[in-house]
């Protein structure tokens, strides 16, 4: 005998109590695939979690974190505390980046400043806890008497038009 449940679309469940009739998912539940024998309970975004997308009969609710926190884990299962720029979250809380490192976001770890000399460049703007260094031209390019990066335009004899 053919399983009538396979005909039940997403948003419904196969009701065995009613001769395998496809019944709509009850309020606050959903089925994201066809042929389901039960509907799943919708996720509720409470507390530190706020609703990003409401639950529908065919898809679960999606949560986000309130201001001051950011999502972690699959489907935002956790909200991690934000730190300030120039800090990182450690086992003991938000700590300032050590000298020579920076973090320009409210999450993640402090990263070392770029080493400009590895690319043969010089430091144009010093790094801070919140910002990486800005590398500029190589030191040789900046030394007095060094040839300019763009050669001067060739001089023309007066009265002659360019060829």
């Amino acid at each position: 005998l053919q399983d009538l449940c396979s005909n039940c679309p997403a948003g419904t469940f196969c009701d065995n109590n009613r001769s395998q009739i496809c019944s709509p998912c009850p309020p606050n539940s959903f089925s994201s695939a066809g042929g389901q024998r039960t509907c799943d309970i919708c996720r509720q975004c409470k507390g530190v979690f706020k609703t990003r997308k409401e639950c529908s009969s065919t898809s679960n609710a999606e949560c986000d974190c309130i201001s001051g926190y950011h999502c972690l884990g699959a489907e935002c299962s956790m909200c991690e505390q934000d730190c300030k720029q120039g800090q990182e979250l450690t086992k003991k809380g938000c700590k300032d980046c050590c000298f020579g490192t920076f973090n320009d976001q409210k999450r993640g770890i402090c990263r070392p400043w770029t080493n400009c000399s590895l690319d043969g460049k010089s430091v144009l703007v010093n790094g801070t806890k919140e910002r990486d260094v800005v590398c500029g031209p190589s030191p040789a390019d900046l030394s007095p008497g060094a040839s300019s990066a763009t050669p001067p335009a060739p001089a023309r004899e007066p009265g002659h038009s360019p060829q």
């Epitope: 299962s77 956790m78 909200c79 505390q81 979250l89 086992k91 809380g93």
Partner: nanobody, 124 residues
Framework: QVQLVESGGGLVQPGGSLRLSCSAS????????MSWVRQAPGKGLEWVSD????????FYEDSVKGRFTISRDNAKNTLYLQMNSLRAEDTAVYYC?????????????????WGQGTLVTVSS
């Protein structure tokens, strides 16, 4: 090892107050968010309240907002739930629970340690 021990439950009349405590040990209490969760007779688990690691951010289930207050004393490694204006529907076993990651608030499914619970009965 991590231990969470609740106390303070009991029988109280409607409109009355109770203060639950949860004594924590075996982990750096001040680095973890904590929660209260309850289970009414014959019902499933219901999230009640969260508090972040430092105690400055608190969150509540709508039905207890304005009546319950979660707090913590990190020096004493203790979590509290002050329950005022109690109703019959607040009757439940109340559990305290620890969140799994430092400075992170998780969903109830992810709490990694739970206490044994304390029974609160609201009845005249």
């Amino acid at each position: 090892q991590v231990q969470l021990v609740e106390s303070g439950g009991g029988l109280v009349q409607p409109g009355g107050s109770l203060r639950l405590s949860c004594s924590a040990s075996g982990f750096t209490f001040s680095s973890y968010a904590m929660s209260w969760v309850r289970q009414a007779p014959g019902k499933g688990l219901e999230w009640v309240s969260d508090i972040n690691s430092g105690g400055e951010s608190t969150f509540y289930e709508d039905s207890v907002k304005g009546r319950f207050t979660i707090s913590r004393d990190n020096a004493k490694n203790t979590l509290y739930l002050q329950m005022n204006s109690l109703r019959a529907e607040d009757t439940a076993v109340y559990y305290c629970a620890k969140h799994p990651l430092t400075f992170t608030i998780a969903t109830m499914n992810d709490y990694d340690y739970w206490g044994q619970g304390t029974l609160v009965t609201v009845s005249s």
